[in-house]
């Protein structure tokens, strides 16, 4: 049975030509989280697994950074950027959890943190 | 449609050389982990050695620790084992291995072998 | 000797279902996936289960696996003169940073 929820940072915001941290954290269970795949709607952008260590999809290298932690930075933003990121953490024994992020991009110097919310 | 080829099988004496070659299509090379499977005649299947996405970590079994070196060229779409030292225990059909995006779920695409034979 | 222990040989005869047994440790099978894969006679090794009971696209249902403890098993309903063929399970063992397969299971339809 599935216990654990994923918290995310939510809906966020952040302007053109910043950093924005994505952030997931997989709580409530005691499955040993085997990767972490981050995904930009059907694009992955990267992956962290346990045994092999991070990858960065080669179109992404550029501006994407590892971490922190199960984490990941994007760099240089741009309108482009603005939708949804998932985060699935694929655990043993108990399968995937999905987490969802929104984010937009905005051109101005309004961007403003959402607040966080779990997803079960 | 996912494929994989290898090449570069053949007669080498014992104490030779060789180097195997996969060339990779129809899935984005540089996102999978990949890895080297062989089976000697009548015997059963026997795991070699794994890369990751970019190359910067190897595994191997104990029989080849030392004398193969697994390595890829994501440029080309092509893996490669350098085979040195060679034995007569090393004669075998050689496939080369595509990995789930999770590589811990195993290998979902093999290619078809390239036979070494190791005989003086 | 293999870190997965298969028995070497099974048998069934048509429609008749057949389960392959794939022992292991603590290190692999418990505490990590397993994969099946079926080598018909001259070919490559096929996958037919991954993630300890997953079904990729293509492969029957008749086809089913399964995981308890330290144990794994692959098994074949509605068995057919095409199912003849070697079995290999295999998982990624933590401890020795390797993949490790069974020795394979001949499996014959009488």
């Known amino acids: 049975m599935m216990t654990g929820t994923i918290e995310t940072t939510g809906n966020i915001s952040a302007e053109k030509g910043g950093s924005i941290i994505l952030q997931c954290h997989l709580s409530s269970t005691t499955a040993q989280v085997t990767q972490v795949n981050w995904e930009q709607q059907d694009q992955l952008l990267a992956i962290c697994n346990a045994d092999l260590g991070w990858h960065i999809s080669p179109s992404f290298k550029d501006r994407v950074a590892p971490g922190p932690g199960l984490g990941l930075t994007l760099q240089s933003l741009t309108v482009n950027d603005t939708g949804e990121y998932f985060c699935i953490y694929h655990t043993y024994p108990d399968g995937t959890y999905t987490g969802r992020i929104f984010l937009e991009v905005l051109e101005s110097s309004v961007a403003e943190h959402g607040a966080r919310f779990q997803i079960p | 449609e996912v494929q994989l080829l290898e090449s570069g099988g053949g007669l080498v004496q014992p104490g030779g050389s060789l180097r195997l070659s996969c060339a990779a299509s129809g899935f984005t090379f540089d996102d999978y982990v990949m890895s080297w499977v062989r089976q000697a005649p009548g015997k059963g299947l026997e795991w070699v050695s794994l890369?990751?996405?970019?190359?910067?970590?190897?595994y191997y079994a104990d029989s080849v620790k030392g004398r193969f070196t697994i390595s890829r060229d994501n440029s080309k779409n092509t893996l490669y084992l350098q085979m040195n030292s060679l034995r007569a225990e090393d004669t075998a059909i050689y496939y080369c291995?595509?990995?789930?995006?999770?590589?811990?779920?195993?290998?979902?695409?093999w290619g078809q072998g390239t036979t070494v034979t190791v005989s003086s | 000797q293999s870190v997965l222990t298969q028995p070497p040989s099974a048998s069934g005869t048509p429609g008749q279902r057949v389960t392959i047994s794939c022992s292991g440790s603590i290190s692999n099978i418990e505490t990590k996936y397993v994969s099946w894969y079926q080598q018909l006679p001259g070919t490559a090794p096929k996958l037919l289960i991954y993630?300890?009971?997953q079904r990729p696209s293509g492969v029957p249902d008749r086809f089913s696996g399964s995981k308890s403890g330290t144990s794994a098993s692959l098994a074949i309903s509605g068995l057919q003169s095409e199912d003849e063929a070697d079995y290999y399970c295999?998982?990624?063992?933590?401890?020795?940073?390797?993949?490790?397969f069974g020795g394979g299971t001949k499996l014959t339809v009488l």
């Open positions: 993630n300890s009971d």
């Open positions: 295999v998982s990624w063992d933590a401890s020795l940073k390797s993949w490790v």
């Open positions: 291995a595509k990995h789930w995006i999770v590589f811990q779920y195993g290998m979902d695409v």
């Open positions: 890369i990751n996405w970019n190359g910067d970590k190897t």
